[in-house]
C-alpha cells in the first residue's frame, strides 16, 4: 500500500542499526571526516612518567590505550553505537548548534595487578579494575 | 623515613580517586575549564523531526537526554569516571597533542517500548535497549 | 517580538579596531547560540563566527579569515553580543549581522538589520 | 569561493516554477546536516525561508519548497511572484570543521 511504501522510505531514510536502525555500512574511515572513525588506539603508560615511581613498585607501566575518533554519520557496525547514540547522532545532524555527537569512548575495559607500597609502607598486590581498554565504541 | 614520606608526596601530587585515584573534590565548574563538566542535559526527541512518524505510532517522541562537558583534571566524584580516565586525564596533562582528554557518555541507559509498523505493515510492541540516558561520565 | 539590534559600525583605518554590539529582546537570550555573519558590498554571506551557551562554557568558533583578529563575547545579563575586531583589513568591510540559532533544526530564524564597517585608509 | 556552490542567476516569468541548487560535499550536506535556505529583499537583512530541508517557518507561503538529495539541495519556488524577485541563500554545516557554510546567493529575477 502507499502507506506502507511511505512507511519503508521514511525508515530507510532515517537509516538504522542493532535495534533502533539500519545504519548503512560505512567504511571505518567517515569519507566525511579528515579524523578516523571511532576505535582503539595504542597507548603505554609509564608509571614514571606519572610521577608513581615511587609507590608503585611493578609494573613499570602498561598498556591503558585509549579511544578516539569521531562518531559521524552513518554509525557503522564496528563503531558499537548504542540506540541512544544513533538518535543521537540524527538528532545533531538535524541541530549540530545544540545537540554534540556521541562520543567515542571505551566498551570493553579490563583490570591489572598492581604491586605497591601503602600509606604504611606495606606491600600490597592489588588489583585494579577498569585500567586497560580492549574496545571502544560510540556512546 | 624519608622514603614513605616520599611516597606520600608522590601519591599525592598524583590526584586520585575511586581505586586508582584520591582525585581531589572540584565544583561542578572545573576552574581550568569554562565548559562545564561532564553531566547529563535533557533532550526531548520528536519521532517526526526525525521523519518516523509514519512507522512508529506511538510514543509521538521521548526524553532522550544527552551527556556533555568536560572531563578535566582534577575529575570528581560527580563524574563518575573510570580509573582508566583518571590516568587518561593525567596522560593527557602530561600530553594534550597526542592523547585526547577522556569523553563524557552515558554511564545509565534505561529503554523504550514502542508501538510501530513492521515492514509487512503488523502492528508491533518492542522494548528497544539503551535508548534513554539516565546518567552520564568520563570515560 | 523576537529583535535583535546590532550597533557600532563605521569607518575605521587599516590596522584599527572596532566593537560591535547586539542588544537582544523578546526572548530568553542564555538560551539560545548566536552568530555574527557579514556582507561585503555586493557579495554574498559570509559566515564570521558563532558563541555558545554557558553550558558549552560560551566555546566561540571562527571563520578562518578572521581567526585570531576577532574575538566574540556575550554577556547573558545584558542580553547582548559582543564582536571585538582588530587588525582590521580593508576585505573586513561589510554590513554586519548578528543572528539567533533556533533551537530545534538550528537555522538563523531571526537576523538583526546590520551595521556597516568600512575599513579604508 | 564558496563551501557550497549555487547558480549565480535564475529567472522566470510570473506564475512560472523555478528551482535553485545548491551542491555541497560529503563533508556538510553529504554528511547528513541539515540545508536551510533564506530570502534576502534589496536592502534587508536575510530572511529564514526553508529550515530543516523543506519546512516553512510560519508566514512563509507554500509556493516555496525545499528538498534534498545526497550531496544536494534545492529550493523550489511555484507561482512565481514578482515580490519574489530576491538573492537566495543555502546554508549547512561543515563537519571537517564543524562550522556554518553558505552557499555564493542566487539572484533571482522576476521577468
Known amino acids: 500500500s502507499a502507506s506502507s511504501r511511505r512507511r519503508q522510505q521514511s525508515r530507510n531514510r532515517s537509516t538504522q542499526s542493532q535495534d533502533v536502525a539500519r545504519v548503512s555500512s560505512a567504511s571505518d574511515y567517515n569519507s566525511s571526516e579528515l579524523k578516523t572513525a571511532c576505535r582503539k588506539h595504542e597507548l603505554y603508560v609509564s608509571f614514571q612518567d606519572l610521577g608513581w615511581q615511587d609507590w608503585i613498585i611493578a609494573p613499570k607501566g602498561y598498556a591503558a590505550n585509549y579511544c578516539d575518533g569521531e562518531c559521524s554519520f552513518p554509525l557503522n557496525a564496528h563503531m558499537n553505537a548504542t540506540n541512544h547514540a544513533i538518535v543521537q547522532t540524527l538528532v545533531h545532524l538535524m541541530n549540530p548548534e545544540y545537540v554534540p555527537k556521541p562520543c567515542c569512548a571505551p566498551t570493553k575495559l579490563n583490570a591489572i595487578s598492581v604491586l605497591y607500597f601503602d600509606d604504611n609502607s606495606n606491600v600490597i598486590l592489588k588489583k585494579y579494575r577498569n585500567m586497560v581498554v580492549r574496545a571502544c565504541g560510540c556512546h | 623515613s624519608a622514603s614513605s614520606r616520599r611516597r606520600q608526596q608522590s601519591r599525592n601530587r598524583s590526584t586520585q580517586s575511586q581505586d586508582v585515584a584520591r582525585v581531589s573534590s572540584a565544583s561542578d565548574y572545573n576552574s581550568s575549564e569554562l565548559k562545564t563538566a561532564c553531566r547529563k542535559h535533557e533532550l526531548y526527541v520528536s519521532f517526526q523531526d526525525l521523519g518516523w512518524q509514519d512507522w512508529i505510532i506511538a510514543p509521538k517522541g521521548y526524553a532522550a537526554n544527552y551527556c556533555d562537558g568536560e572531563c578535566s583534571f582534577p575529575l570528581n566524584a560527580h563524574m563518575n569516571a573510570t580509573n582508566h580516565a583518571i590516568v587518561q586525564t593525567l596522560v593527557h596533562l602530561m600530553n594534550p597533542e597526542y592523547v585526547p582528554k577522556p569523553c563524557c557518555a552515558p554511564t545509565k541507559l534505561n529503554a523504550i517500548s514502542v508501538l510501530y509498523f513492521d515492514d509487512n505493515s503488523n502492528v508491533i510492541l518492542k522494548k528497544y535497549r539503551n535508548m534513554v540516558v539516565r546518567a552520564c561520565g568520563c570515560h | 517580538q523576537v529583535q535583535l539590534v546590532e550597533s557600532g559600525g563605521g569607518l575605521v583605518k587599516p590596522g584599527g579596531s572596532l566593537r560591535l554590539s547586539c542588544a537582544a529582546s523578546?526572548?530568553?537570550?542564555?538560551?539560545?547560540?548566536v552568530h555574527w555573519v557579514r556582507q561585503a558590498p555586493g557579495k554574498g554571506l559570509e559566515w564570521v563566527g558563532r558563541?555558545?551557551?554557558?553550558?558549552?562554557?560560551?566555546?566561540?568558533e571562527y571563520a578562518a579569515s578572521v581567526k585570531g583578529r576577532f574575538t566574540i563575547s556575550r554577556d547573558d545579563s545584558k542580553n547582548t553580543l559582543y564582536l571585538q575586531m582588530n587588525s582590521l583589513k580593508t576585505e573586513d568591510t561589510a554590513v554586519y549581522y548578528c543572528a539567533r540559532v533556533e533551537r530545534s533544526k538550528s537555522g538563523f530564524d531571526n537576523w538583526g538589520q546590520g551595521t556597516l564597517v568600512t575599513v579604508s585608509s | 569561493q564558496s563551501v557550497l556552490t549555487q547558480p549565480p542567476s535564475v529567472s522566470g516569468a510570473p506564475g512560472q516554477r523555478v528551482t535553485i541548487s545548491c551542491t555541497g560535499s560529503?563533508?556538510?550536506?553529504?554528511?547528513?546536516?541539515?540545508v536551510h535556505w533564506y530570502q534576502q529583499l534589496p536592502g534587508t537583512a536575510p530572511k529564514l525561508l526553508i529550515y530543516g530541508q523543506s519546512e516553512r517557518p510560519s508566514g512563509v507561503p507554500d509556493r516555496f519548497s525545499g528538498s534534498k538529495s545526497g550531496t544536494s539541495a534545492s529550493l523550489a519556488i511555484t507561482g512565481l511572484q514578482a515580490e519574489d524577485e530576491a538573492d537566495y541563500y543555502c546554508q549547512s554545516w561543515d563537519s571537517s570543521q564543524t562550522l556554518v557554510v553558505f552557499g555564493g546567493g542566487t539572484k533571482l529575477t522576476v521577468l
Open positions: 560529503s563533508s556538510n550536506i553529504g554528511a547528513g546536516y541539515s
Open positions: 558563541i555558545r551557551l554557558e553550558t558549552h562554557g560560551y566555546a566561540a
Open positions: 523578546g526572548f530568553t537570550f542564555s538560551s539560545y547560540v
